[in-house]
Structure formats: structure tokens, C-alpha cells
């Protein structure tokens, strides 16, 4: 592709919808951040499309990203992180849309991972822990916690809780015996920076005891 | 119609410490980057530090780092620097600006003289 496009081509763009949206990662690969952009309508004709972002970036005036699928991306260390960039859809020369963003406020949190409940019997309740890579990172370090879960059977019937640490208890008595249950957790930036829920991690799937006949307690 | 007000320049001896402020009144302050630079006697205007909106991200000119430290306090609408062991060459009036704009900043101040002697 050779990126630009014919007169006609170029009448027929403009009469396009080329909003997107966009989001940062940052140190999501040692020290390098990324952004990711897409357009929101996903039947857009992307040939000879392409993004490019200009201003507070170091030691480059501007950078284009690269296409991977229906998605555009950067992966890079060259982001300021101060002040405003602006992130335009571009045919050629010509630029079709453009948006001004500071990147520390479209930032979205990598998933959680390793997340698990342990049931302990004398306490009866469970322990929910889970783990985020951004304990160890410099900047997006404080967020808040979604854990969600239901019972297996109640399809759209998730109980959340918000949380900032990585830890959360649930009662055994708030939850019904002998059930399968699914959880799963996701972050979004609460201090400092601003931007939206990561994914979803991988839910984990635990059961509660049956109810002890003779007390009235779960087993 | 004044929007971004330093103060707290003057004159100090080499090795001291000086703290400067820049009060502005533009409403978009909370969500603004903001800078400070000087320009030395003769000399163009020279970027020294700048701090993104939250103040979590810093960023700092060669020249200072180690020994100035950019801050703000948004509650306030004010950006802080304070600049430690101070040196002839740091003699200069400090402006300080504010949104950073696609590599433009859109706001200055009047600046605050510092001298520093030895």
C-alpha cells in the first residue's frame, strides 16, 4: 500500500465517519508504553488510513503507529506524559479527524491475573486474592478493584465489590450452600491517572459447602 | 485578566535555596500541565521542569535535575519549584506556563527575577 490515496478516493473519505477512541498502557513492556486506537465503527474501509500522533513526545516531533488488523498501534518509550498530543486519522498528507489527548487519561490497566478463593472452615468465609503487575510499576501504581461474582446458574445476576488492595473476604453465610460460583476482577486507574477498566481476568470457579444438617451450618 | 502570577524571586547567595510559586486563574488549571523556564541575561528562553496535571509524572532540563523539584497543588490552582544549591549561572527571570499543547504552551507569565551571587 502505498498509503495515499486517489482524488476520488479521497471525496469518497470525507464523506466517512472516522471517529475512534483511543488508550494508553504504560510500562507494559519494561519501560516502553503503548496506545492502542481504533475506529468505532468497525465497518470502515481502513485502506490507506493511517494514525499518527504529534506533541509531547521526547526528542521526536511526531510518530505513526502500526496497523494490525483493525486496530492501531504504538509501542514506545518517546511519550512525554505531560501536556497534550494530538492523534489524527490521516490519508496521505491530509488529515481526516484529529483529537487533542493527554495520554495519563486514557490509561487502561493491564488485567489482574493469578486470582484464587481458599475457604477456611473455622473462619467460614472465603478469601479472595488476586495479583496486578502494576505493584511494581513507577507510575500507574494506585487503582480500584472490581471483583465480581456470581452463582453459575443466575446468568446476568453479578454482585460487585470495589476494592484498592488485592485481597477481599466474603462471608459464607452471604453466599448459598452447595453452589458453583464464578469470580473474576478487573482495574481502572484511581489516583493520579485517569482512563478506563482493563479486561476482565480470567474468572476462577469455586464451590460452597453443603449446609450441616444438624446445626444449620455449611460444611 | 492576569492568569499566571510568579513570585518568591530575589536575591540569594550561591549554595542557598529559594522556593518559587505561580498562582494562575485559568479554570482548567486541575487538568493543565505546567512548566517552568528562565531566561538568563542575554540569553533565549531555556526550559528547566514541567509536571503533568496529577503532578505524578515530572519532567526535568539537564541543567536542574537533582537539584530543583517541580510540584503543584491543585486545591490551590499553584505550581511550586524549589530550587536547591543554587549557582551563578541560575541568575535569570523564571516564567512559569501553563498547557502544553501539541508541543505549545499556551499560557506565561509575567516571571520573577532571581539573582544568585557568589
Known amino acids: 500500500e502505498s498509503g495515499y490515496a486517489q482524488n476520488g478516493d479521497l471525496e469518497d473519505a470525507e464523506l466517512d465517519d472516522y471517529s475512534f477512541s483511543c488508550y494508553s498502557q504504560l510500562e507494559v513492556n519494561g519501560s516502553q508504553h503503548s496506545l492502542t486506537c481504533a475506529f468505532e465503527d468497525p465497518d470502515v474501509n481502513t485502506t490507506n488510513l493511517e494514525f499518527e500522533i504529534c506533541g509531547a513526545l521526547v526528542e521526536v516531533k511526531c510518530l505513526n503507529f502500526r496497523k494490525l488488523q483493525e486496530i492501531y498501534f504504538i509501542e514506545t518509550k518517546k511519550f512525554l506524559l505531560i501536556g497534550k498530543s494530538n492523534i489524527c486519522v490521516k490519508v496521505g498528507e491530509k488529515s481526516l479527524t484529529c483529537k487533542k489527548i493527554d495520554l495519563t487519561t486514557i490509561v487502561k490497566p493491564e488485567a489482574p491475573f493469578d486470582l484464587s478463593v481458599i475457604y477456611r472452615e473455622g473462619a467460614n468465609d472465603f478469601v479472595v486474592t488476586f495479583n496486578t503487575s502494576h505493584l511494581q510499576k513507577k507510575y500507574v501504581k494506585v487503582l480500584m478493584h472490581d471483583v465480581a461474582y456470581r452463582q453459575e446458574k443466575d446468568e446476568n445476576k453479578w454482585t460487585h465489590v470495589n476494592l484498592s488492595s488485592t485481597k477481599l473476604t466474603l462471608l459464607q453465610r452471604k453466599l448459598q450452600p452447595a453452589a458453583m460460583y464464578e469470580i473474576k476482577v478487573r482495574s481502572i486507574p484511581d489516583h493520579y491517572f485517569k482512563g478506563f477498566w482493563s479486561e476482565w481476568s480470567p474468572s476462577y470457579y469455586f464451590r460452597t459447602p453443603e449446609i450441616n444438617n444438624s446445626s444449620g451450618e455449611m460444611d | 485578566e492576569v492568569q499566571l502570577v510568579e513570585s518568591g524571586g530575589g536575591l540569594v547567595q550561591a549554595g542557598g535555596s529559594l522556593r518559587l510559586s505561580c498562582e494562575s486563574s485559568?479554570?482548567?488549571?486541575?487538568?493543565?500541565?505546567m512548566g517552568w523556564f528562565r531566561q538568563a541575561p542575554g540569553k533565549g528562553r531555556e526550559f528547566l521542569a514541567a509536571?503533568?496535571?496529577?503532578?505524578?509524572?515530572?519532567h526535568y532540563s539537564d541543567s536542574v535535575q537533582g537539584r530543583f523539584t517541580i510540584s503543584r497543588d491543585n486545591a490551590k490552582n499553584t505550581v511550586y519549584l524549589q530550587m536547591n544549591s543554587l549557582k551563578s549561572e541560575d541568575t535569570g527571570r523564571y516564567y512559569c506556563?501553563?498547557?502544553?499543547?501539541?508541543?505549545?504552551?499556551?499560557?506565561w507569565g509575567q516571571g520573577t527575577q532571581v539573582t544568585v551571587s557568589s
Open positions: 506556563a501553563e498547557d502544553y499543547d501539541t508541543d505549545v504552551w499556551q499560557y
Open positions: 485559568i479554570s482548567t488549571f486541575s487538568s493543565d500541565a
Open positions: 509536571i503533568g496535571w496529577s503532578g505524578a509524572v515530572t
